[in-house]
Every structure is written in C-alpha cells, then in structure tokens.
C-alpha cells in the first residue's frame, strides 16, 4: 500500500503521538500545526480546520514552535549598568549583560537580572583572582618585594624595581625609588653617598687570577659559584 500522508488536523492512531511541529489539541482531539517562532496561535484548530497563526506584535516574541494564544513580552530595557547583547525581536527576547567593570550578581535564565561593580583593589593590594561575568574580583595584600599603587579591578601586585642603589625602599603601595644617576654628595673620609659604577682601562691588561673565574675584562671578572650579579638578592 502506498504511504498515507496525513494533513493537519488529523486524528492520531491510538497510542501514537503527533509529529514534529504538531501538538495534540485536547478540545478538538486532533493533531494540529504549531506556529513557528515569531508567531502565536490566533485561532486554535477544530476537527475541520488547522491552527491559524499570526505574527507577534512589537515588543513581544516567541522563540519556539508553539500554540500559545499570546506572544511573550520582551524584558524591560537594559539598565545603565548593562549592555543589550541581544535585541528584542519577534523571535527572541532582549538579553542584557553587565557592562565592562561589572559582574552579574543575580542571573536569570538568559542574561543578568542584577549587575554589581567589580571590586577595586586599593593601593597595597592586587588582584588575586580576576572578575568574571559572574564572579567578583578577589584582592590580596601585596607580598614583600611587590607593590600596587593603584585602585584597580585589574592590576596585580608588581615586583619592586631593582635598583643599583635604593634611594627610597619600596613598600606594598609604592615602588622602590632608585638613586641611579642621582647627583653625588660630598663625603667624609670613611663616608659614602650614593654609588655609581665606572670601570676604566686601556690596552689589554690581565686581571689578577681568581680561584674561581668570572668574566674578566682583560683582568676582570672572576666567575664563581655566585650567579650573575644582576640577579643577586637584596635590593
């Protein structure tokens, strides 16, 4: 027998269900057509006539195949701390997400109901865990040798600059200040005021041999177990 194609509305076989994009109307006791996204059921089906669909009005929508008598209302306009990431159309609701610098403190099915500003870490504190769309920033105190001098939701604690000579030591909220190239001051015989390096020589001269050898400028550098001075500890 040739396959039978049933056109809606039709009575389903006992124990069977309606096909995709159809629904069973209890009143008519028939399988009837659903309305496509962006539409709603203006007139429900009967035993002899199929569903009559109509387009959603402005500011309403249906996102799925449906047989609802009225389209759903789009959500209210996004608040000032939000951005509209999806506009209200006949087929989709408006979606509001938090604008940069904010996170979603209370979410809804799609988008965010309540945004809150990301925490700013004050000077002396840096970001331990960055904020995400749904979580706030976590701050931590800057460890010794690091600092943050900003009030910021993104800045981490940074290492103090390494000075040849430190003019002002750094702390948790301030970088170290170096003397380098600062004017020298007069000094008493055994006194020292601010250093600055200089090495001189001409023609190749041999350095006095060192037990361990470091680079030697023709007489220079004994290199031994110690790491390069650039990396040596202390400020």
């Amino acid at each position: 027998l040739p396959a039978q194609v049933a056109f809606t509305p039709y009575a389903p076989e006992p124990g069977s269900t309606c096909r995709l994009r159809e629904y069973y109307d209890q009143t008519a006791q028939m399988c009837c057509s659903k309305c496509s996204p962006g539409q709603h059921a203006k007139v429900f089906c009967t035993k002899t006539s199929d569903t009559v669909c109509d387009s959603c009005e402005d500011s309403t929508y249906t996102q799925l195949w449906n047989w609802v008598p009225e389209c759903l209302s789009c959500g209210s306009r996004c608040s000032s701390d939000q951005v509209e990431t999806q506009a209200c159309t006949r087929e989709q609701n408006r979606i509001c997400t938090c604008r940069p610098g904010w996170y979603c403190a209370l979410s809804k099915q799609e988008g965010c109901r309540l945004c809150a500003p990301l925490r700013k870490c004050r000077p002396g504190f840096g970001v331990a865990r960055p904020g995400t769309e749904t979580s706030d920033v976590v701050c931590k105190p800057c460890a010794p040798g690091t600092f943050s001098n900003t009030t910021s939701s993104t800045d981490i604690c940074r290492p103090h600059q390494i000075c040849n000579v430190v003019a002002i030591p750094g702390n948790a909220s301030m970088d170290a200040v170096c003397t380098s190239t600062s004017p020298t001051r007069s000094m008493a015989p055994g006194a020292v005021h601010l250093p600055q390096p200089v090495s001189t020589r001409s023609q190749h001269t041999q350095p006095t041999p060192e037990p361990s050898t470091a680079p030697s400028t023709s007489f220079l550098l004994p290199m031994g177990p110690s790491p390069p001075a650039e990396g040596s500890t202390g400020d």
Partner: antibody, heavy 108, light 104 residues
Framework: PELVAPGASVKISCKAS????????MNWVKQRPGKGLEWIGR????????DYNGNFRGKATLTADTSSSSAYMQLSSLTSVDSAVYFC?????????WGQGTTVTVSS | SLAMSVGQMVTMSCKSS????????????LAWYQQTPGQSPKLLIY???TRLSGVPDRFIGSGSGTDFTLTISSVQAEDLADYFC?????????FGSGTKLEIE
Amino acid sequence: PELVAPGASVKISCKASGYAFSHSWMNWVKQRPGKGLEWIGRIHPGDGDTDYNGNFRGKATLTADTSSSSAYMQLSSLTSVDSAVYFCAPGRWYLEVWGQGTTVTVSS
Amino acid sequence: SLAMSVGQMVTMSCKSSQSLLTSSTQKNSLAWYQQTPGQSPKLLIYFASTRLSGVPDRFIGSGSGTDFTLTISSVQAEDLADYFCQQHYSTPFTFGSGTKLEIE
C-alpha cells in the same frame, strides 16, 4: 690614616647617607699604588648577606649597623701587602659613589 | 699610559674573558670610572654605554660582549686621570688594570 703593626687587626668604618642604606649593597675596594683596584666584597645591611672575593676570604670581615647607617670592614693578620687605600661604595652592580678612602699602613 | 693633546680624541679598550651581555635585559654589564690624582674613583659610564648624569657628553662608552671602549671625543686638561673598567656581570666583580691619561 691608620698605622698598624704587622699581625694586628684594623676595623675601618664607612658612614653612609643620602640613600636607603638598609636596602642597598655596600662594596669595599682595595687600591695599592701601581696595583689597580681589587674588589674585596660586599654586604647587604638589611639582611647581613655577604659576598666575598675569594682572595679576601679570611682576611676581610664585613659587617654593618643599620641603626647608624655604618658599614665596617675588619682586616686581620695584617702584613705589608695589606697597606693600601680602602674604599667603600654602595651599589648592587656598579659603584655609584665612592667614599674618600681610608689609608691603612702596616709597619712596625 | 696615553699622552694626548687637548682637543684630541682618545680611545681606551677593555676586554673581558667572557661575554658581559645579559640576555634577559640585552645590557652589557660594564662600567667605566675616572680617578683624578689624589681623588676617589668616580663613575662615568655603566651598562657599557649609559652616561652618569652630570658626566660631560664627550665621554662615550661603547662595545658589546667582550670588547668595550671608552672614547673621549675631545680631551680637556681636567681629563688627566686614570681610567678603569669594571665588570658588574657577576661577583666577584673585577676591574681592569687601568689606563693613565696624560696631557701633553
């Protein structure tokens, strides 16, 4: 100038100012006439960390007092080869400013 | 030692037994000092070519790796001094034997 007898010890001091003494390395350098400059070692006054030239280990001992911003170098078992001018100079790498130097003369 | 006339250009060299170039910073760890008679050494140049604030621009440091030069573009009478290089790449720091600059 320091005049000391052979076999004796001498402690040279260096008073620092104008920078963060506790946070900066202090170096000591020896200069003998006609012999150029020799780096003896350095100390970090903040934590007492020291770094010596192997040639001066056992000869020089570096200390520092942060309360007075002073660095010290003790030279022991002095001989004539220890007669020299000794300079202190702060710097992690290069020596930014040098003290005027202390002359040590070892003589009986 | 070098004997030069005022206004002449002078160059002094400093050679290291190993490279003084720090790869992470691309800086050469070499300094130049001037010691005038009866005075303490004074820093002129560090990181091979950085002139200390206040040092006349006739003093020019150059070079990389193992070979370095201090140039005085136009010697002045007050430049009469000993000049030393120092590697500040690793400890123990070491100095060059020095160049004595004499003015004719």
